[in-house]
């Protein structure tokens, strides 16, 4: 039975050429989480592995930075970066808990942080 | 701390058998993949079997085909290999390795962690 | 069966200079390549995967490049650790899983 929870950051903005952190975090349950991917629709951005460590997909090496924590860091906005993100967190033995957050890149200034939410 | 220890490796005849066991501690056994890897002395590394975290798909080398099965006790946090038919050339030592990967993430098979290895000697 | 090929088969670097190993697959394995280090009496170590992703603890000196069936290991400036053999291996995703035959970086 998957009793956990994951909060993410939810609908957030952020100024073009700016950079935001994507942030998701399981909680209520004792599950082992053996990896972390991050997925921006149906591309690959980044894995966070128990083993191996983080590996960032080649496409996105220069605007893509690991952490804070299992959170990811994204670099030098432009407005194609606007839509949804995923965390998707494998775990023992529940199985995957997917997170989800909308950002938007903004042209002007008035960028600001959404509230935060929870995704059963 | 993860940790492998490998067991049952020593002399046998050829056409003969022997079972190897890697006792895993560490680390949440369950939805691992797994491998064994062996090393002729003197020579390079080759893998031989992998099985699933669940041990319900298993793979083998072609030069171990028919002769050695690869499987898996969770229950008892450990991996087995038996090896039948044994030949001179199947003379190594052979590692038990955990994979990154899970049923769940999909499998590396790339290899982070190792025991230190147990040596195999096929001779009459 | 896809063949893999390191060379120079041994390769003789003073220490802090730049050790430069290649590998190359019979057939493109993508960027499904990974390299190992091991020293005498020891299991390898995990150095590099996905070609050029450096593994949890691995030192910045280690890097690699390549895809498709040319790739390289660069160790900047090398340590007296480093003395050690390398081995690539390719990881398609079905099997077998081959390695190279070595690289063995000795002192010169």
């Known amino acids: 039975m998957m009793t956990g929870t994951i909060e993410t950051t939810g609908n957030i903005s952020a100024e073009k050429g700016g950079s935001i952190i994507l942030q998701c975090h399981l909680s209520s349950t004792t599950a082992q989480v053996t990896q972390v991917n991050w997925e921006q629709q149906d591309q690959l951005l980044a894995i966070c592995n128990a083993d191996l460590g983080w590996h960032i997909s080649p496409s996105f090496k220069d605007r893509v930075a690991p952490g804070p924590g299992l959170g990811l860091t994204l670099q030098s906005l432009t407005v194609n970066d606007t839509g949804e993100y995923f965390c998707i967190y494998h775990t023992y033995p529940d199985g995957t808990y997917t997170g989800r957050i909308f950002l938007e890149v903004l042209e002007s200034s008035v960028a600001e942080h959404g509230a935060r939410f929870q995704i059963p | 701390e993860v940790q492998l220890l490998e067991s049952g490796g020593g002399l046998v005849q050829p056409g003969g058998s022997l079972r190897l066991s890697c006792a895993a501690s560490?680390?949440?056994?369950?939805?691992?993949?797994m491998s064994w890897v062996r090393q002729a002395p003197g020579k390079g590394l080759e893998w031989v079997s992998a099985?699933?975290?669940?041990?319900?798909?298993?793979w083998h080398a072609d030069s171990v085909k028919g002769r050695f099965t690869i499987s898996r006790d969770n229950s008892k946090n450990t991996l087995y290999l038996q090896m039948n038919s044994l030949r001179a050339e199947d003379t190594a030592v052979y590692y038990c390795?955990?994979?990154?990967?899970?049923?769940?993430?999909?499998?590396?098979?790339?290899?982070?962690?190792w025991g230190q290895g147990t040596l195999v000697t096929v001779s009459s | 069966e896809i063949v893999m090929t390191q060379s120079p088969a041994t390769l003789s670097v003073s220490p802090g200079e730049r050790a430069t190993l290649s590998c190359r697959a019979s057939?493109?394995?993508?960027?499904?390549l990974a390299w190992y280090q091991q020293k005498p009496g020891q299991a390898p170590r995990l150095l590099i995967y996905s070609a050029s992703t450096r593994a949890t603890g691995i030192p910045a000196r280690f890097s690699g490049s390549g895809s498709g069936t040319e790739f390289t290991l660069t160790i900047s400036s090398l340590q007296s650790e480093d003395f050690a053999v390398y081995y690539c291996q390719q990881y398609v995703p079905h099997p077998p899983f081959t390695f190279g035959g070595g690289t063995k970086v000795e002192i010169k």
């Open positions: 099985i699933s975290g669940s041990g319900a798909s298993t």
């Open positions: 390795a955990k994979d990154p990967g899970t049923d769940s993430t999909g499998y590396y098979y790339i290899w982070r962690y």
């Open positions: 560490g680390f949440t056994f369950g939805p691992y993949g």
């Open positions: 057939q493109s394995v993508s960027s499904n």
